[in-house]
C-alpha cells in the first residue's frame, strides 16, 4: 500500500481467483484513543472499533472510503483504491490502446516546435467517476522540471455503439534548450482513477521524435503565362521554431482530386514555393516536416486549383 | 575551414555535407523510430556519446558570438562517431548488409571532420568508451542505438551549418 495523495491510498493486488489479497492497517488521524468506530462509504454498519482497523483487501467491495468516528463526529477518512496486477501485468482497463505507432500505446504526445512545450492525449470509453493527474520530468534518475496543466476533456466521438472521450494535457519544460541535442528523454506519468480502480500509464520520448509542425500557412497560387503550370507559395507556420535559417523545414507539394486514387502531381522542396500542374476540380496541398530529422509530417494545408 | 585559431569554416560545403549525413543516417537505419530502444537500458550504452548541449554555443546566438566552441564540439562528435562506425560494433558479426549505407556514412563523417579541422591543427577529441558487446544480438542493439543517437547529433550539426551558411558566410 502507498499514498497517492493525502488520505488516498493505493492497494496493489495480485488479481486471480481465490487470491489472498492484502492485509491493510488503517490508523485514525486523531489524538483520541478510545470510543472510535469505523464505517465504509455510506453504510452505517460498524466494521470495527479502536484507533486502528485491520482489513483484508481482496476485491473492489473492500475498497472505498473508510471513516473513523467518535460520538457521531467524523474524525478522519482514508480512501482505498485498488491497482490490479494480472499475470504480472498491471491492468490497463481505463484507457484505450491507440495502437499507433505500436501496440500498447495509451498516451500519445506531439510538439509543434522545439520550445519544450508538448501536448499528450489519451482515449477512454468511460464517461463518469473519472479523474486524471499528470506529472512529467526530463530524465528519471536526476529529473529536471516539466510543468503540466490539468487534464481536460478535449473531444467526444461516436465509434459504432460506443462513445469515445479524448482527454489532453499541455506540458512545458521549465528550462528548455531548443537548439541542444536531447540526451535524456521526457517522462510523462498519468494517474487514472475510475471509481475505486487506480491505474498508471507512462510514456517516454525525446521532443525531436514527437515533433509535428503545424501546416504551412498562407498558400497562394499564381498561374504561369502560356502554361498549365501554377506557382504555389506558402509560409512557415507561426508556431514553428525560429530562426527558420536554423530550424528549417522541408515540404511536400501535391495536386490531387477528391479521391486518393486519382492521379496526382507531387514534388518535394526545401523552398517556400514550387511549380506544379493544376487540374480542374483538384486541390493543391502542402505539408511540412523537419528538414534534418525525420519526425512526423504536418497535416496538409490546401487550396482549390480553380 | 574552421581552424582552432578561429577562422571561418566553409559554411556552404559543411552545410551540404551535413545534410548528406542526415540523409545517410536515416537511410542507414530508417525503421529505428519503430523500435523503442529506451526500453533496453539506454543509460549505460549510449550515455558516453558526445551530445551537443545547451552550453556548447550551437544555438543561433552562440554561433553569432563565437562559432568556435560549437564547431569544436561538432568536430569531437564527428570523430567519435567516425571511430564508432569503424569499430567492431559495426565490423563484427552479424555482418552488415552489403547495401548498408554505413560505409558511406563513415566516409562522410570523416569528410566533414576534415573540412572542420585541416591537418596540422588539433582539437582535443573525446575518448571512445570501451563498448565491446559479446553477443551478436547485443551488437545489433548497440548499432541501432548508436545510429539513433547519430541521427540526433547530425540533425543539430546540419542546423548549425545551414544557419551559418545563411547568416555567417562571408
Amino acid at each position: 500500500i502507498w499514498e497517492l495523495k493525502k488520505d488516498v491510498y493505493v492497494v496493489e493486488l495480485d488479481w486471480y481467483p481465490d487470491a489472498p489479497g492484502e492485509m491493510v492497517v488503517l490508523t485514525c488521524d486523531t489524538p483520541e484513543e478510545d470510543g472510535i468506530t469505523w464505517t465504509l462509504d455510506q453504510s452505517s454498519e460498524v466494521l470495527g472499533s479502536g484507533k486502528t482497523l485491520t482489513i483484508q483487501v481482496k476485491e473492489f467491495g473492500d475498497a472505498g472510503q473508510y471513516t473513523c468516528h467518535k460520538g457521531g463526529e467524523v474524525l478522519s477518512h482514508s480512501l482505498l483504491l485498488l491497482h490490479k496486477k494480472e499475470d504480472g501485468i498491471w491492468s490497463t482497463d481505463i484507457l484505450k490502446d491507440q495502437k499507433e505507432p505500436k501496440n500498447k500505446t495509451f498516451l500519445r504526445c506531439e510538439a509543434k516546435n522545439y520550445s519544450g512545450r508538448f501536448t499528450c492525449w489519451w482515449l477512454t470509453t468511460i464517461s463518469t467517476d473519472l479523474t486524471f493527474s499528470v506529472k512529467s520530468s526530463r530524465g528519471s534518475s536526476d529529473p529536471q522540471g516539466v510543468t503540466c496543466g490539468a487534464a481536460t476533456l478535449s473531444a467526444e466521438r461516436v465509434r459504432g455503439d460506443n462513445k469515445e472521450y479524448e482527454y489532453s494535457v499541455e506540458c512545458q519544460e521549465d528550462s528548455a534548450c531548443p537548439a541542444a541535442e536531447e540526451s535524456l528523454p521526457i517522462e510523462v506519468m498519468v494517474d487514472a482513477v475510475h471509481k475505486l480502480k487506480y491505474e498508471n500509464y507512462t510514456s517516454s520520448f525525446f521532443i525531436r521524435d514527437i515533433i509535428k509542425p503545424d501546416p504551412p500557412k498562407n498558400l497562394q497560387l499564381k498561374p504561369l503565362k502560356n502554361s498549365r503550370q501554377v506557382e504555389v507559395s506558402w509560409e512557415y507556420p507561426d508556431t514553428w521554431s525560429t530562426p527558420h535559417s536554423y530550424f528549417s523545414l522541408t515540404f511536400c507539394v501535391q495536386v490531387q482530386g477528391k479521391s486518393k486514387r486519382e492521379k496526382k502531381d507531387r514534388v518535394f522542396t526545401d523552398k517556400t514555393s514550387a511549380t506544379v500542374i493544376c487540374r480542374k476540380n483538384a486541390s493543391i496541398s502542402v505539408r511540412a516536416q523537419d528538414r534534418y530529422y525525420s519526425s512526423s509530417w504536418s497535416e496538409w494545408a490546401s487550396v482549390p486549383c480553380s | 575551414r574552421a581552424v582552432p585559431g578561429g577562422s571561418s569554416p566553409a559554411w556552404t560545403q559543411c552545410q551540404q555535407l551535413s545534410q548528406k549525413l542526415c540523409t545517410l543516417a536515416w537511410s542507414a537505419h530508417p525503421l529505428v523510430g519503430h523500435m523503442d530502444l529506451r526500453e533496453e537500458g539506454d543509460e549505460e550504452t549510449t550515455n558516453d556519446v558526445p551530445h551537443i548541449q545547451c552550453g556548447d554555443g550551437c544555438d543561433p546566438q552562440g554561433l553569432r558570438d563565437n562559432s568556435q566552441f560549437c564547431l569544436q564540439r561538432i568536430h569531437q562528435g564527428l570523430i567519435f562517431y567516425e571511430k564508432l562506425l569503424g569499430s567492431d560494433i559495426f565490423t563484427g558479426e552479424p555482418s552488415l548488409l552489403p547495401d548498408s549505407p554505413v560505409g558511406q556514412l563513415h566516409a562522410s563523417l570523416l569528410g566533414l571532420s576534415q573540412l572542420l579541422q585541416p591537418e596540422g591543427h588539433h582539437w582535443e577529441t573525446q575518448q571512445i568508451p570501451s563498448l565491446s558487446p559479446s553477443q551478436p544480438w547485443q551488437r545489433l542493439l548497440l548499432r541501432f542505438k548508436i545510429l539513433r543517437s547519430l541521427q540526433a547529433f547530425v540533425a543539430v550539426a546540419a542546423r548549425v551549418f545551414a544557419h551559418g551558411a545563411a547568416t555567417l558566410s562571408p
Epitope: R228, K263, V267, D270, T275, I277, R279 | S27
Partner: antibody, heavy 118, light 107 residues
Framework: QVQLVQSGAEVKKPGASVKVSCKAS????????LHWVRQAPGRGLEWMGW????????EHAPKFQGRVTMTTDTSTSTAYMELRSLRSDDTAVYYC???????????WGQGTMVTVSS | EIVMTQSPATLSVSPGERATLSCRAS??????LHWYQQKPGQAPRLLIY???QSTSGIPARFSGSGSGTEFTLTISSLQSEDFAVYYC?????????FGGGTKVEIK
C-alpha cells in the same frame, strides 16, 4: 495488369511527319497521365512531354515546342504522338508511358522505332 | 533546364559484388530523383522513386539514397540479370531530364 502497346516501326524522309500510337489496357484510361520519351540509338533517354487524357492538357519539353502534338482518343484508350518536320537526328525509339504520378514513369510501352533517312 | 550527370559511364563489377552508381544534379532537387534500369532491346523499368522509395516487385538488393544534388543507387550483390544500363531522372522541374546513364557490365 496495366499494359501499353505501341504501333510498329516507321521509316520516314526528312521533313515528313510521323504519328505513333499507344493503346492502353488494364486500367481506366483517364486515370493515368501519359508521357512520351525517346531514345536515339546508343544514346540516353529524352523526355518529350505529357498529356492528361481526362482533359487533353499537355506540356512539352521546350525542344519540341511547335513540332510535336500529343492527343488521345478516350473511346479507344489510345494516345498519339505526332512529330513534324522530321530530321535525321529524330531517329530514335519512341516510348509511351503511363503513371498516376505526373513526374516519373512507371509503365512503359515496348517502344516504336522511327528511322528518318533520305 | 536541370542537367543530370551520372558517373561512372561504365562500371565493371563481378557477380556477387556491390555496385554504387552516382547521379549529380546541376542544382538542388530535394528528393525529386528516380532510377530506371534498361536492358538491351527492352524498355526502361522503374526501380526507385523519390530517391529512396522502392517500387513493388523490385528486389531488395536495389536501394537509393541522397538528397539535394548528390544521389546514389546501390546494388548490394550483383546478379547476372542486373547487368544493364541505369538512368536517373529528376522531377524537380519541367522539362524532366535524365542522366546519361551508367552501364554496369560484367568484370
Amino acid at each position: 495488369q496495366v499494359q501499353l502497346v505501341q504501333s510498329g516501326a516507321e521509316v520516314k524522309k526528312p521533313g515528313a511527319s510521323v504519328k505513333v500510337s499507344c493503346k492502353a489496357s488494364g486500367y481506366t484510361f483517364t486515370d493515368y497521365y501519359l508521357h512520351w520519351v525517346r531514345q536515339a540509338p546508343g544514346r540516353g533517354l529524352e523526355w518529350m512531354g505529357w498529356i492528361d487524357p481526362e482533359n487533353g492538357d499537355t506540356e512539352h519539353a521546350p525542344k519540341f515546342q511547335g513540332r510535336v502534338t500529343m492527343t488521345t482518343d478516350t473511346s479507344t484508350s489510345t494516345a498519339y504522338m505526332e512529330l513534324r518536320s522530321l530530321r535525321s537526328d529524330d531517329t530514335a525509339v519512341y516510348y509511351c508511358n503511363a503513371n498516376k504520378e505526373l513526374r516519373y514513369f512507371d509503365v512503359w510501352g515496348q517502344g516504336t522505332m522511327v528511322t528518318v533517312s533520305s | 533546364e536541370i542537367v543530370m550527370t551520372q558517373s561512372p559511364a561504365t562500371l565493371s563489377v563481378s557477380p556477387g559484388e556491390r555496385a554504387t552508381l552516382s547521379c549529380r544534379a546541376s542544382q538542388s532537387i530535394s528528393i525529386n530523383l528516380h532510377w530506371y534500369q534498361q536492358k538491351p532491346g527492352q524498355a526502361p523499368r522503374l526501380l526507385i522513386y523519390f530517391a529512396s522509395q522502392s517500387t513493388s516487385g523490385i528486389p531488395a538488393r536495389f536501394s537509393g539514397s541522397g538528397s539535394g544534388t548528390e544521389f546514389t543507387l546501390t546494388i548490394s550483390s550483383l546478379q547476372s540479370e542486373d547487368f544493364a544500363v541505369y538512368y536517373c531522372q529528376q522531377s524537380n522541374s519541367f522539362p524532366l531530364t535524365f542522366g546519361g546513364g551508367t552501364k554496369v557490365e560484367i568484370k
